[in-house]
């Protein structure tokens, strides 16, 4: 027998569309070889109507599709506006339509159910509106209108003109009739039920010149759309419930094992705590859509998720609802990255951060996730060189390593910079991660001074200490700017008493600047690294000042005096709010901090090169 | 929580038919199939067949070794499902399990189903 494996009979009814799941072992030549749907005919043969190879028949052109999903071994055969004439004997197979592996299967597309002649099918989603239409003739336009159920041989009145309401539908539906001249009154009925399912009957007007007319309200359960995620990346859940809830508070919710559904985020400030840092409800459209984009996806994750609003922002029947079923991939094209990178006080961090590698031209950005009301991600610094002011001097965005890697580094480290921050790119959303910043107890490895002052014309020479743990690391001096940090000429200078226990592996790397110029105003990292990975950093900021005294300076950190106070975020920053995440150009309009200039002039010596044994952290 | 309560089982002789109904309470936001398991006496549980559901379109999943002989059935207004048995054959005595659940993957898999019913005995004399 065949060990692929699908539906033996599906049904439906005209104008429907369906969705063939088939499954097959999902060995490697499986996962890659042509997958086909086709329709036996009466000579035995099998005529391909679609494949995974892009082959659409003519018959289907524009309503099916098949979809691979090959980490599954599941192939999918959707097909749409179905017609009484599509009912026959298929197959769905991997291979040779002839001699592959296959499944027989029975389509049965039926007329439907019988209805009286006339009527108006109305076809909406549980929770949604519908207004059903009510024509009428001049002679009956003062009589009474009404809107009655038919409930199998009888006719249960619903609503009518002179003001009754059953109490099955009270609060969510009203009779319109309109103004002279118009022949037609509407029923509009909001928050649909599946109760509501059933055929209708409008009459305006009583005796024998009554007017009739049916209506069948067909109310479906939305099926949930199936989402297939990667470990570790993204997703994002777009809801559109409709103009009628577009000022009710909104909701994502996933349902557990007792059927009824946890918030994971509403629009009234309620999070899961399994989602902090990592999940933002983004601001709603004027036609009441939004979106909750969750990152950093663990297999836990998994599960059947909800959308939709209600004023408590929790599930409620007979309210509008959006579903998705999420499957989370564990055989994930996105590499494993720190989740938690910890730095201390005065230290610094580096951070990598994954792109898809078929993107590199992409635009790179760090935003700051924060959780307050629907959480937002204010950017921080971007590649194209654009840094938010409180982070000038400390921060940068570095392509390097590259290839589906690159890094940010944060540096002068507080208490205030603990927590969750997003990479994320302009391109493939599905690529978006975060990582938590955390400070823990210890002192940074790498010792500068905290301010320098230089004398314009003079030589200036700045120290940087690093214990012998970092004797084999490539060490560098680089001046900072909002556009990166451009590596300066160093000079190793052999031991340093910085580090009493070090002995003489500890050792002191030395910027020069000579001479001091106007342009040699800035911030100055000192920093280690392996290649292109990036571990630790130190920051200086050097003042210039006119010429007092003669000679030159050599600044030890015993004489540094406290680093300058950060500039505060001016209040004309706008904040880039959660939308700025789905369309990354927008955070163009975050305020520009001014470029500090060329990089300085200054006399190249020898630079230690090294290997690095850890990545980010100040301290192990 | 969503309970399933079976019945329809009993004895019956080899080549009869029986019908087993499974009937379906309480909330089931997450309910688009139902289908039926047997476990005969110190073998596994085993798929035996399942309906899915979106609208009014029908999917029904068979075992190869009841094609042909069983069919499942459903009624969406009383939430029950129908398995009608027959040509009963001596090796289709077993508890049968209803199960229901999301069933978005692979029906013949147990863990698509969130719910279990207690089970009916069906034995097949020869």
């Known amino acids: 027998k065949s060990p692929v494996f699908g539906p033996q009979e599906v049904s439906s009814v005209e104008g429907n569309s369906v969705s063939i799941k088939c499954y097959y072992p999902p060995t490697s030549v499986n996962r890659h070889t042509r997958k086909y749907w086709c329709r036996k005919g009466a000579s035995g043969r099998c005529i391909t109507l679609v494949s995974s190879e892009g082959y659409v028949s003519s018959n289907y052109a524009g309503r099916a599709n098949l979809t691979n999903f090959p980490e599954n071994g599941t192939f999918v055969v959707n097909i749409a506006q179905l017609s009484r004439d599509d009912s026959g004997h298929y197959k769905c197979g991997l291979g040779i339509n002839s001699r592959g592996l296959s499944f027989d299967v029975s389509l049965e597309v039926s007329q439907g159910p019988e209805l009286p002649n006339g009527t108006e099918v109305y076809t909406v989603d549980v929770g949604r509106t519908v207004t059903i239409k009510c024509p009428f003739k001049t002679e009956n336009a003062p009589k009474t209108k009404a809107l009655y159920k038919k409930i199998g041989q009888t006719s249960v009145l619903v609503i009518d003109s002179r003001n009754y309401v059953n109490p099955n539908y009270k609060d969510r539906i009203r009779l319109r009739i309109p103004g002279t001249g118009q022949l037609i009154f509407t029923v509009v009925i909001d928050r649909l039920r599946l109760s509501d399912h059933g055929l209708y009957l409008c009459q305006a007007g009583d005796g024998s010149n009554r007017d009739e007319k049916n209506a069948d309200l067909q109310v479906l359960e939305p099926e949930p759309e199936l989402v297939y995620e990667d470990l570790r990346g993204s997703v994002t859940f777009h809801c559109a419930l409709g103009l009628e809830v577009a000022n009710v508070a909104k909701f994502l919710c996933r349902v557990n094992s007792r059927e009824t559904c946890d918030v994971v985020i509403n629009t009234l400030g309620k999070r899961d705590s399994a989602f902090e840092g990592r999940i933002l409800l983004n601001p709603q459209d004027k036609d009441g859509s939004f979106s909750v984009v969750i990152t950093g996806l663990r297999k836990e994750d998994e599960g059947r998720y909800l959308c939709g609003a209600h004023s408590d922002g929790q599930l409620q029947e007979g309210w509008p609802i959006q579903a998705w079923q999420l499957f989370v991939n564990e055989e994930s094209t996105i590499p494993r990255s720190p989740t938690v990178v910890k730095g201390v006080a005065g230290g610094s961090v580096a951070v990598l951060c994954p792109y898809n590698p078929k993107e590199s031209q992409s635009l790179k950005y760090w935003c700051l996730w924060e959780g307050a009301q629907n959480g937002r991600c204010p950017l921080l610094v971007e590649s194209q060189g654009l840094v938010q002011e409180q982070y000038e001097g400390r921060l940068s965005l570095l392509q390097e390593p590259g290839n589906g890697t690159f890094t940010v580094i944060l540096n002068q480290l507080t208490t205030q910079d603990a927590g969750f921050y997003w990479c994320l790119t302009n391109g493939d959303t599905r690529w978006r991660t975060t990582v938590e910043i955390k400070i823990i107890e210890g002192e940074p490895n790498l010792k500068v001074p905290g301010n320098v002052t230089a004398v314009l014309g003079e030589t200036l020479n700045i120290p940087c200490h690093f214990p012998c743990k970092f004797s084999s690391y490539e060490k560098y001096w680089c001046k900072w700017s909002n556009t990166g940090c451009q590596t300066l000429p160093s000079q190793d200078e052999g031991p340093s008493e910085a580090f009493v226990n070090c002995d003489e592996n500890s050792r002191l790397v030395s910027l020069t600047l000579n001479p001091v110029t106007r342009a040699d105003e800035g911030w100055y990292w000192c920093g280690v690294k392996q290649g292109h990975f990036y571990g630790e950093t130190a920051a200086v900021y050097v003042a210039v000042e006119e010429k007092k005294v003669a000679g030159s300076r050599y600044v030890s950190p015993a004489k540094a005096d406290a680093a300058p106070d950060e500039k505060v975020l001016d209040s004309g920053v706008r904040e880039i709010e959660n939308k700025a995440i789905q369309d990354p150009r927008l955070f163009a309009e975050e305020k520009v901090v001014a470029d500090t200039g060329d990089q300085a002039g200054g006399s190249r010596a020898s630079v230690d090169s090294s290997s690095s044994e850890e990545q980010g952290g100040s301290s192990k | 929580e969503v309970q399933l309560v079976e019945s329809g089982g009993g004895l019956v002789q080899a080549g009869d038919s029986l019908r087993l109904s499974c009937a379906a309470s309480?909330?089931?936001?997450?309910?688009?199939?139902m289908g039926w398991f047997r476990q005969a006496p110190g073998k596994e549980r085993e798929f035996v067949a399942t309906?899915?559901?979106?609208?009014?379109?029908?999917?029904?999943y068979y075992a190869d070794s009841v094609k042909g002989r069983f069919t499942i059935s459903r009624d969406n207004a009383k939430n029950t499902v129908y398995l009608q048995m027959n040509s009963l054959k001596p090796e289709d005595t077993a508890v049968y399990y209803c199960?229901?659940?999301?069933?978005?993957?692979?029906?013949?898999?147990?863990?698509?189903?969130?719910?279990w019913g207690q089970g009916t005995l069906v034995t097949v004399s020869s």
């Open positions: 309906i899915k559901w979106s609208g009014s379109t029908n999917y029904k």
């Open positions: 309480g909330r089931t936001l997450t309910t688009y199939g």
């Open positions: 199960a229901a659940g999301t069933v978005l993957g692979d029906p013949r898999v147990l863990n698509e189903y969130d719910y």
